[in-house]
Interface confidence: medium
Amino acid sequence: QSGPLPKPSLQAQPSSLVPLGQSVILRCQGPPDVDLYRLEKLKPEKYEDQDFLFIPTMERSNAGRYRCSYQNGSHWSLPSDQLELIATGVYAKPSLSAHPSSAVPQGRDVTLKCQSPYSFDEFVLYKEGDTGSYKRPEKWYRANFPIITVTAAHSGTYRCYSFSSSSPYLWSAPSDPLVLVVTGL
């Protein structure tokens, strides 16, 4: 064996955003014929020597960063990319609004504003059907998400979450959906 074994992938099914009380499975996927899998939760360090972790009822304590690796013979693989498992529904939902309007002419700009009943300093925006979140607004203006030169691809249903940077894996419930309509197509 020359060099470390390639890293496995770690995924949460059905999603890494898990409402409190719901179930989730973390699955580590390496090459065929692995001798041993190790799935770890970081801070505090806990691990299971298997390729999956079933969480039947999501609790606050389950939220956090996870990674996995595997062993073949005496060789350990590189660790997987870390997976952030988020508990949602920990706090009341924020409200999501569009400025100047949720009907936006193509090529113009719109700002989606997420407002929390708490003094949270972190907000994140998701579009239905997209795999990832829109940019975290520390680069922007707290709860404002500017979307520039809008196109038809930005039409759709958005939700936001709020949380505190001191507890980054404990999120609010999702906002009510906001439907963004791109006009003039």
Epitope: Q106, G107, R108, D109, K127, D130, G132, Y134, K135, K139, W140, P146, I147, I148, T149, T151, A152, A153, H154, G184, L185
Partner: antibody
Framework: QVQLQQSGAEVKKPGESLKISCQAS????????IAWVRQMPGKGLELMGI????????RYSPSFQGQVTFSADKSINTAYLQWSSLKASDTAMYYC????????????????WGQGTMVTVSS | QSVLTQPPSMSAAPGQKVTISCTGT?????????VSWYQQHPGKAPKLMLF???HRPSGVSNRFSGSKSDNTASLTISGLQAEDEADYYC??????????FGGGTKVTVL
Amino acid sequence: QVQLQQSGAEVKKPGESLKISCQASGYSFSSYWIAWVRQMPGKGLELMGIIYPGDSDARYSPSFQGQVTFSADKSINTAYLQWSSLKASDTAMYYCARQGKTGSYYFGAFDVWGQGTMVTVSS
Amino acid sequence: QSVLTQPPSMSAAPGQKVTISCTGTSSDVGGYNYVSWYQQHPGKAPKLMLFEVSHRPSGVSNRFSGSKSDNTASLTISGLQAEDEADYYCSSYTGSSTWVFGGGTKVTVL
């Protein structure tokens, strides 16, 4: 890899018409805004405007409105910049550039540039 | 449409640091985090060096960094190298599909 290939240099007389091109490869041409940028000899960069090839929606900077026309043919991944009547003051290097994005969201900068088309207008 | 204000030229010795300023208004630099920087060598097309004030595209050296305060953005080149000699342009989004560029700064490596 992602590339924008522009048409070759042009020498024209005042009053003539001209259409220069910018052919994209290596990405989904229809899904990114394309900008046209002018650079007059020894001067800085000026945004002329942008076009969305998906439906040829064009947006012109105020000082270029009515002076030029943008178009796009998504079947051949090509954007065009056109003049109906050239002036000596149109002498410049013209660049096409792609507005970059992360995921679905534009980040307000031009991440891929063509090599430029030099247009010389002289009697 | 007024350009953003940059110093026309700056110079420094190899290994030194140079910081280029780019001053606009609350309608452009101050109003958006969509400030970008481009490097242009003579006879070449511009190349994106930083976007969203301080983010480097892949392949750009970490010697290039950016920041913004109020209506002024800055590009810092640390550990200056001969190949950094070029013109540098800042740009800011100004809303509704329009951008403005700075007048450019010629950086000379002594």
